[in-house]
């Protein structure tokens, strides 16, 4: 087959006329959209056949595929065919119209598909979007075919800009039929039971009408069969449920319970398993470590958390200094115990805007008729340090003293430092640390007292300066685990008149 012009892609002007010729050794025909448009067929003296397709007054709607094929006179078609793609850029045509079936794309598996939005002009930039979103999707575009890729079960539109107007395509809908033809779920009323209690399991199949259930369970292996009950859940169409009920469980009933479901229409099957534990008696077990000393910062909120496992559900109580705690109406204390899984619990004590009086001995107790556990810790309230007083005095002995007093919890550390060059220190030069035993020019005396009522330490430190010959900036810094505070005082020599 010989096609002129050969293509394989042509860009033609709107309103123009164009002639396509195809020739071959047998009768040939032009096809457009599975139909044969009017064309002139001829047979030359040398025995070659030709067909001439004249496209007149071209519009954007003439954009698309054109095929030339052998059209055997005996009605047989050979495989050989030539494809030509013609673009007719036409600003009056946005996206080429689609057949209804092209707008709906149906899939049963994850496979590459094409969203066939096509334009008349190969120079146009086309983007793909989810119908509900503005962000362009990173999918490759072929101007002759559309966007090809693996698409989610959504609706999509294509966008392009022609001149200064934005044009949207029709919406394309991707429908994916989930053919995991059987969807089985197994659950138990409880996965942990005490001996003598009942085991009840449910196996549910969604979306199938004709299914067969088969249960495997520890008791079956010893030949003790249990007859399951199958029912339809009326409020949920085509949810079929098989219930396996074992009354008065024994320790030997612990193990794996499997529900196997088969359906005959497509010969599919699926199975799900669940583990059941039968315990001799109930239990309560702490999980993780909680230190015997806990800290909270004054006026901040603090949550103390205990994680434990229990069956059956326990009662949980909190105590402070052996007095039972409850949620306070003022909202200063909040207690909560929540079930985070079937047998796992988290109990929390929240102290809101902690006060000094809330320091003390706390205990959490979890118990039921079979077992109990308790956990205790001391709560220390940390108070940021503050310098309460920094004063300078001049005893008759001639030395000068600076006294610094502060409080905090835990016990504050004290650091004395001085700046001798007031112009450059501390911005350019670091302050000098004072009170080191090697320095004879200053002596340090520090006393620490614990105030039981306020539950904090008081530090009083006195710095003795032997001879001060020029103004000196003395700084007292108190530090503890939750903060630091600083004050400074200018110490001047005895001799200076403005002292």
């Amino acid at each position: 087959l010989v096609v002129t012009p050969p293509g394989p892609e042509l860009v033609l002007n709107v309103s123009s006329t164009f002639v396509l010729t195809c020739s071959g050794s047998a009768p040939v025909v032009w096809e457009r959209m599975s139909q044969e448009p009017p064309q002139e067929m001829a047979k030359a003296q040398d025995g070659t056949f030709s067909s001439v397709l004249t496209l007149t007054n071209l519009t954007g709607l003439d954009t698309g595929e054109y095929f030339c094929t052998h059209n055997d006179s005996r009605g047989l078609e050979t495989d050989e065919r030539k494809r030509l793609y013609i673009f007719v850029p036409d600003p009056t045509v946005g996206f080429l119209p689609n057949d209804a079936e092209e707008l709906f794309i149906f899939l049963t598996e994850i496979t590459e598909i094409t969203i066939p939005c096509r334009v008349t002009d190969p120079q146009l930039v086309v983007t793909l979007h989810e119908k509900k979103g503005d962000v362009a999707l990173p999918v490759p575009y072929d101007h002759q075919r559309g966007f090809s890729g693996i698409f989610e079960d959504r609706s999509y539109i294509c966008k392009t800009t022609i001149g200064d107007r934005e044009v949207d395509s029709d919406a394309y809908y991707v429908y994916r039929l989930q053919v995991s033809s059987i969807n089985v779920s197994v659950n138990a009323v409880q996965t942990v039971v005490r001996q003598g209690e009942n085991i009840t399991l449910m196996c549910i199949v969604i979306g199938n009408e004709v299914v067969n259930f088969e249960w495997t369970y520890p008791r079956k292996e010893s030949g003790r069969l249990v007859e399951p009950v199958t029912d339809f859940l009326l409020d949920m169409p085509y949810h079929i449920r098989s219930i396996l009920h074992i009354p008065s469980a024994e320790l030997e009933d612990s193990g794996t319970y499997t529900c196997n479901v088969t359906e005959s229409v497509n010969d599919h099957q699926d199975e799900k398993a669940i583990n059941i534990t039968v315990v001799e008696s109930g239990y309560v077990r702490l999980l993780g470590e909680v230190g015997t000393l806990q800290f909270a910062e004054l006026h901040r909120s603090r949550t103390l958390q205990v994680v434990f496992e229990a069956y059956p559900p326990p009662t949980v109580l909190w105590f402070k200094d052996n007095r039972t705690l409850g949620d306070s109406s003022a909202g200063e204390i909040a207690l909560s115990t929540r079930n985070v899984s079937e047998t796992r619990y988290v109990s929390e004590l929240t102290l809101v805007r902690v006060k000094v009086a809330e320091a003390g001995h706390y205990t959490m107790r979890a118990f039921h008729e079979d077992a109990e556990v308790q956990l205790s810790f001391q709560l220390q309230i940390n108070v940021p340090v503050r310098v309460l007083e920094l004063s300078e005095s001049h005893p008759d002995s001639g030395e000068q003293t600076v006294r610094c007093r502060g409080r905090g919890m835990p016990q504050p550390n004290i650091i004395w430092s001085a700046c001798r060059d007031l112009k450059r220190c501390p911005r350019e030069l670091p302050p000098t640390l004072l009170g080191n035993s090697s320095e004879e020019e200053s002596q340090l005396e520090t006393n620490v007292t614990y105030w039981e009522e306020e539950q904090e330490f008081e530090v009083v430190s006195t710095l003795r300066l032997q001879h001060v010959d020029r103004p000196l900036s003395v700084r007292c810094t108190l530090r503890n685990a939750v903060g630091q505070d600083t004050q400074e005082v200018i110490v001047v020599p005895h001799s200076l008149p403005f002292k």
Epitope: D153, R154, S155, Y175, R176
Partner: nanobody, 116 residues
């Protein structure tokens, strides 16, 4: 939750007709087109046509034109698909489906068996 529930399995003789129902719930029935699709044993999905539940307009694939009739009863939010002139090639699972924009929703399928 959008949900489509179809009528039960059918066994038909060649030449007979079958009518499959599809009841919608969990959304305004008239808001979204209902598509009818079938899957013959071992084959892919084949689109049959759509129904606009709002207007009652339908459009069927060329292959089924003249044989398929799609109707609806808005008072009970149910769409119907009737296929006439059944042959053994029409043995398939027939599905109704709709698209909420963010995902598609399917009926559970109705098995239609054509045999003499």
């Amino acid at each position: 939750q959008m949900q489509l529930v179809q009528s039960g399995a059918e066994v038909k003789n060649p030449g007979a007709s079958v009518k499959v129902s599809c009841k919608a719930s969990g959304y305004p029935f008239s808001a979204y087109y209902i598509q009818w699709v079938r899957q013959a044993p071992g084959q892919g999905l084949e689109w049959m046509g759509w129904l606009n539940p709002n207007s009652g307009d339908t459009h069927s694939a060329q292959k089924f034109q003249g044989r398929v009739t799609m109707t609806r009863d808005t008072s009970i939010s149910t769409a119907y698909m009737e296929l006439s002139g059944l042959t053994s090639d029409d043995t398939a699972v027939y599905y109704c489906a709709t698209h909420g924009g963010d995902r598609s929703y399917w009926g559970q399928g109705t098995l239609v068996t054509v045999s003499s």
